[in-house]
């Protein structure tokens, strides 16, 4: 899966879209969860009605909300007044039984606020490096990384 | 009426290629996922793999990656079994089915299945 | 993988009888299991699906039961058409494995 990149700014709220075939996903109840480390697990943050017939029906688990086109075959989360630590990779998954299958890689990008003229150094961006593979640009405030790019912070 | 047709049975050699196939009707065969399953003689049943014709995302049991191939044709609503080198121990019955869809259920049962094609490995 | 085991292997009764086989599953698979009855030189057929509802057109003498990893189906009364072999299968996560079969028999 390439890597799309959703660019919101601090204190507003970003709204990240999945798409997904509806026929090959029907009936399977989707979920969004933070990819914690490179190679480490995804950790859901919030999933969809239990019943799939209710998916269109907003679930928020703190400021992340969740709600899913089931016919249209879309999944939409939004994060509500979007916080630096929100930046980082995701995951849009559909699951079935214990399976959970990758929809969309997700880095989501927070920018400073124009208007805040407080210091901007603790927001992150992705830096450069050697290692992430190519991706395609999509927008609505989205893109897709770039060769070189890498989805985490460096560690020091 | 759901159907799904599977190609006559086919004897062959130690080392020869072979594909096999399983045609559906009745149905919106690109929107549903089709499994191959084997059924050596006087045994029990076996789940080799699984394919979704939409957009041929395959799915293959550790036990028979590397071993078959499975693919799908979905302007001919077909879905194909091969081996590029054939062993006797291939000899079996091979069933496709697919993967009921309800309503409500993503499911991962088989509610329609074919007739089988016997496969026959025998120098 | 998920290992299913089945019990008996094979049990021999007589019309009008109860029988009951038995799946077990190496792990947790919730409700994601299915039934399918196979007689000689056919295709199986499907009976029960999520553990316990039954497929369209199955009669009512065929139930399942279970949660987990223990699954249960039952013939309430036997009839001649039920002697076959019967298999379960997990539908949790890949490999949707089968258990070995159950072959009823007459006795």
């Known amino acids: 899966h390439n890597t799309t990149v959703f660019q919101g700014v601090a204190g507003q709220s970003l709204q990240v879209s999945c798409p997904y075939d509806s026929m090959k996903h029907w009936g399977r109840r989707k979920a969004w969860c933070r990819q914690l480390g490179e190679k480490g697990p995804c950790q859901r943050v919030v999933s969809t009605h239990n019943l799939w017939l209710l998916s269109f029906l907003r679930r928020w688990n703190g400021s992340t909300a969740i709600t899913d086109d089931t016919l249209g075959g879309t999944l939409t989360i939004t994060l509500r007044n979007l916080q630096p630590h929100d930046a980082g990779l995701y995951q849009c998954q559909s699951l079935h039984g214990s399976e959970a299958d990758t929809l969309r890689k997700v880095l989501v990008e927070v920018l400073a606020d124009p208007l805040d003229h407080r210091d901007a150094g603790d927001l992150w961006f992705p830096g450069e490096s050697e290692s992430f593979e190519d991706a395609h640009v999509e927008h609505s405030i989205s893109r897709s990384l770039l060769e070189g790019e890498i989805p985490f912070p460096p560690t020091s | 009426e759901v159907q799904l047709v599977q190609s006559g049975a086919e004897v062959k050699k130690p080392g020869e290629s072979l594909k096999i196939s399983c045609k559906g009707s009745?149905?919106?065969?690109?929107?549903?996922?089709i499994a191959w399953v084997r059924q050596m003689p006087g045994k029990g049943l076996e789940w080799m793999g699984i394919i979704y014709p939409g957009d041929s995302d395959t799915r293959y049991s550790p036990s028979f990656q590397g071993q078959v191939t499975i693919s799908a044709d979905k302007s001919i609503s077909t879905a194909y079994l091969q081996w590029s080198s054939l062993k006797a121990s291939d000899t079996a019955v091979y069933f496709c089915?697919?993967?009921?869809?309800?309503?409500?259920?993503?499911?991962?049962?088989?509610?329609?299945w074919g007739q089988g094609t016997l496969v026959t490995v025998s120098s | 993988d998920i290992q299913m085991t089945q019990s008996p292997s094979s049990v021999s009764a007589s019309v009008g009888d109860r029988v009951t086989i038995t799946c077990r599953a190496s792990q947790g698979i919730s409700n994601w299991l299915a039934w399918y009855q196979q007689k000689p030189g056919k295709a199986p057929k499907l009976l029960i699906y999520a553990a316990s509802s039954l497929q369209v057109g199955v009669p009512l003498r065929f139930s399942g039961s279970g949660s987990g990893t223990d699954f249960t189906l039952t013939i309430s009364s036997l009839q001649p058409e039920d002697f076959a072999t019967y298999y379960c299968q997990q539908a949790d996560s890949f490999p949707r494995n089968f258990g070995q079969g159950t072959k009823l028999e007459i006795k």
């Open positions: 009745g149905h919106s065969f690109t929107n549903y996922w």
């Open positions: 089915a697919r993967q009921r869809t309800f309503y409500y259920d993503s499911s991962g049962y088989f509610d329609y």
